[in-house]
Structure formats: structure tokens, C-alpha cells
Amino acid sequence: DTEIKVNPPQDFEIVDPGYLGYLYLQWQPPLSLDHFKECTVEYELKYRNIGSETWKTIITKNLHYKDGFDLNKGIEAKIHTLLPWQCTNGSEVQSSWAETTYWISPQGIPETKVQDMDCVYYNWQYLLCSWKPGIGVLLDTNYNLFYWYEGLDHALQCVDYIKADGQNIGCRFPYLEASDYKDFYICVNGSSENKPIRSSYFTFQLQNIVKPLPPVYLTFTRESSCEIKLKWSIPLGPIPARCFDYEIEIREDDTTLVTATVENETYTLKTTNETRQLCFVVRSKVNIYCSDDGIWSEWSDKQCWEGEDLSKKTLLRHHHHHH
């Protein structure tokens, strides 16, 4: 009874299509598959960024796989052929591993790359990224930002750079169509006549870095003798109401009364007849139903009621004050 053997896939390689971290892993079928013509061969692929403790594992019948990587580090991958038990009289057969690596040859020392990269997607409309120049780089150093996400034919360069002393220190992005809920890849590279500049790579999802506009149209409504309803509206823009969480800060007679987090555009407050002044502010953030993370908006303008008996069952007058 001869032992069944199978060869590893051929020509296993990692291909960089220029998408700033989104790479193709591809291979060819193993040699000598003639004995297994009736069989559907599978491949077990393992890959990771060098330095990561865990491998990602994929089992596929295809001859390629695509995923995102951190190009600040190297990438290692290995693959072997699997013959399912149906082909081998009851036991799965695996080939030896074929292995490959990929890395971008780093230019320049790490200190020359951009520092403190910060990106915010304002109101789910306007993406702005800013950075500081590398440590010890000269004023002749300039940085260029490129970005890519699935849907673009190729990586694009920043349209509107923000400058300081002639150096690019940020980017205002153009309209980004169908760019959320997918990985967004950025590379900031640099050039200098004096020394090579290290490139930096960043990956995030836009919906997770949204900073909304603050809520607007804050009002008070008397609900009962001991309850006041605070109401506000979502700001103008593309973020639907279902995506907001709110934090309210309420001050009663100059002392902090309540800080609360709510999901709706209303909050009912218990009051006493002694209350002479009531002020509140609200801020918003994209909630867990629409993103994994987010940034609180600025606080709204402060809305106050003062000078009348709060126990009156009326729609209360309100004045604008700045928080």
C-alpha cells in the first residue's frame, strides 16, 4: 500500500499592486496532480505581518487571495496543498509548506518618517489628516500623501496639502465615494536632497474616525410639574439619526446636576419648584450600531432658561449663550 503524497503549490508569491498595503498572494497548482484528476484540491494558506504572534489561516480552492497588511513591517506567508479524505481512502493528505516573504526595502532612518499622524473624518464628509515632520529633517524635506481604498483604480495623491514653512504637514481629501466600511490605506513618503526619508503606512476605516457636528436647536418643554423635556436636533449632514449617541451636561442654578448619555434626541429631567435657572449643552458621537469607534463632537451652544418660574406649564423661553 503506497503512501499518497502531494507536492506543494508552485510559484507562490506575494504581489504588491501598488495599493499601499493591499496585497495579492498567488500560486500555481502543484506538479503531478494527474493522479487526482477527480479530486478538488484545496490549499491552506497562512500569513502574517512579521512580528505578529498569530497567523491568519485561509482554506481555499482558488489560486489567489487578497488582504491588507501593514507595510511598515515585513510579511511572511506559507501555503500547502490539501487532498481531502475523499481522494485518499479516508485520510487527509498535506504537502510540505511553500514559503515566501515580502517587504518594502526601507529607505532612511525611522526618525525621518512623519510623526503624530492624525486623521479625522469630519461629519462623515470631510477627511483631514495632519502630521509633524520627522525628527531632525531639514526644511528641504517634503512629504507626499497617497491613498487607496477598494473601488479606486490606483493610489491617488493628496489634492490639497496643508503647508507650514513650505513643508506639507497635512492633507484635505477630496470627495471619497463609497469609502466607508472598508480599509482605507495611506502612505506618506518623503523626499530630501540631503538624506533618504522613511515612508509610513497607515490603515483605518473612515466610519471609525468620524467627528460629527454638534447637535442644534436645543429647546425645553414642560412635561409635568416636576419634569422638563430637553430636546435637540441632529446637525445638517449625511449622518442619520440612528447613528448618534449623545452626552448631555445639565447645570441647575450653577451647580452640575446631571451628565447623561442617551441614544435619542430627548432627555427628561426631574426638577424642583426651587430651580431658578437651567442650562444644558449636548454633544454627539457615532454609536456602536454604525461604527466601532468615533470622536465626540464639540459641545453645542449652551441653552439656558432663567428668570421665570420653572414650574409654570408653558413652553419655556430660551436664550443662546456660548458654552
Partner: antibody, heavy 119, light 111 residues
Framework: QVQLVQSGAEVKKPGASVKVSCKAS????????MNWVRQAPGQGLEWMGR????????DYNQNFKDRVTITRDTSASTAYMELSSLRSEDTAVYYC????????????WGQGTSVTVSS | EIVLTQSPATLSLSPGERATLSCRAS??????????MNWYQQKPGQAPRLLIY???RQGSGIPDRFSGSGSGTDFTLTISRLEPEDFAVYFC?????????FGGGTKLEIK
């Protein structure tokens, strides 16, 4: 909520200078470019220049041949446009106008400041 | 500088009709895969209002009857069904390169 409030109308003599202010509120001033556009009576629109409040970077329309100076005070969320060596053809309404970047156009405009140059 | 030519200078139509306004640039206003062409509406005594940016993107709060199209040097603003409040002057503007320039305007008047 976004508001651009400009200073009041001005009447100036030829050769004088005028400085128009534009106070921004309802948004983060430094995140958006501030443009200046003018419109002579019954005429079209003419872009004068823009400032990036984030870093102070400025682009001018060279047609104004060094007569225009655009500045900003980020702490006051205010942009300024000064036009010198005024002549009668500078009589126009001057607008400040906010735009996020070159691909977004100009989405909010001030109410306009009328400048009349007359001897 | 890039010169923008709008046509017609005046367009006389009735409410409910379709309006097609044209803007031609002296050179391409495309770059980075974007058409840097914007459209504005202006009514007497008022500041302009952004209708369309990047050739075809609707400005905030702009009704769906306004649409933009085109690339390179030829651009069109279409108002699918004219409302009484749409009769105004319309300007195209390029933001590809400094100095930003405006077209001479098309006056849309009631027939």
C-alpha cells in the same frame, strides 16, 4: 449653524485702502479654506484669493498685482481682506466664502460688503 | 488662466420645463480623477449658493432636480423641472488651478 458675518459697507476715495473682515462661527475655522470673491455692479464674480487658516498659506489672483492682502486671526475665527490703491473700478460687493478644499467648491458665503470708491 | 464660457447668456423658459446650461473651459479642468467644476445660483441682492461641486456632486440641501455632468472641458447643469424659485443667474467656476475663475453667467428668466 455655519455663519460668515462681514463688516459693514465702506465708501472710500481713490488711492485709499479698505480692509474687510469676515467673522466665522458654527464650524472649526482652521479646517476650511477662506476665499474672497468680488462682484462689480451688474457684473460676474471674480476670485481674489484664499487663505488656509490652518497654516496661513495664501494664494492670490495675480490680476490684483500686489494690491490685495489676505490675513487671518485664528483665535478670533476671523479672516481679513485688504485692498489698497483703490480705483473706481474696485467698486463692488466683496464676499468671503468658505470651502473645504479645491474639490468641494465654496459652500458658505458671507452676506457681502459693499465698497464704493468715489472722489 | 482658465477661461470659462457659459451659454446661452440668457435662457427663457416656463415653470415645469427642463433647463440645460452649458459651460466650456479653455483647457481641461480634470486632475486626480476629479473634475474641478462647480455651479452656483445667485438671486438679486443675495450671495451665490453652491449647487454642484466636482462636476456632479450635489451641494448640501440642494433639491434633486439640480444635476451636473461633464468632464474635461465641457460641462452641463440641468434643472429637470423648473420651479418659480429657480429663475436666477447661474455661474460655473473652476477650482483646478489658481486663479479660480468663473464663467460670465447664464440668466434664467421666466418666458
Amino acid at each position: 449653524q455655519v455663519q460668515l458675518v462681514q463688516s459693514g459697507a465702506e465708501v472710500k476715495k481713490p488711492g485709499a485702502s479698505v480692509k474687510v473682515s469676515c467673522k466665522a462661527s458654527g464650524y472649526t475655522f482652521s479646517n476650511y479654506l477662506m476665499n474672497w470673491v468680488r462682484q462689480a455692479p451688474g457684473q460676474g464674480l471674480e476670485w481674489m484669493g484664499r487663505i488656509d487658516p490652518y497654516d496661513g498659506d495664501i494664494d492670490y489672483n495675480q490680476n490684483f498685482k500686489d494690491r490685495v492682502t489676505i490675513t487671518r486671526d485664528t483665535s478670533a475665527s476671523t479672516a481679513y481682506m485688504e485692498l489698497s490703491s483703490l480705483r473706481s473700478e474696485d467698486t463692488a460687493v466683496y464676499y468671503c466664502a468658505r470651502g473645504y478644499g479645491t474639490a468641494y467648491g465654496v459652500d458658505y458665503w458671507g452676506q457681502g460688503t459693499s465698497v464704493t470708491v468715489s472722489s | 488662466e482658465i477661461v470659462l464660457t457659459q451659454s446661452p447668456a440668457t435662457l427663457s423658459l416656463s415653470p415645469g420645463e427642463r433647463a440645460t446650461l452649458s459651460c466650456r473651459a479653455s483647457e481641461s479642468v480634470d486632475n486626480y480623477g476629479i473634475s474641478f467644476m462647480n455651479w452656483y445660483q445667485q438671486k438679486p441682492g443675495q450671495a451665490p449658493r453652491l449647487l454642484i461641486y466636482a462636476a456632479s456632486r450635489q451641494g448640501s440641501g440642494i433639491p434633486d432636480r439640480f444635476s451636473g455632468s461633464g468632464s474635461g472641458t465641457d460641462f452641463t447643469l440641468t434643472i429637470s423641472r423648473l420651479e418659480p424659485e429657480d429663475f436666477a443667474v447661474y455661474f460655473c467656476q473652476q477650482s483646478k488651478e489658481v486663479p479660480w475663475t468663473f464663467g460670465g453667467g447664464t440668466k434664467l428668466e421666466i418666458k
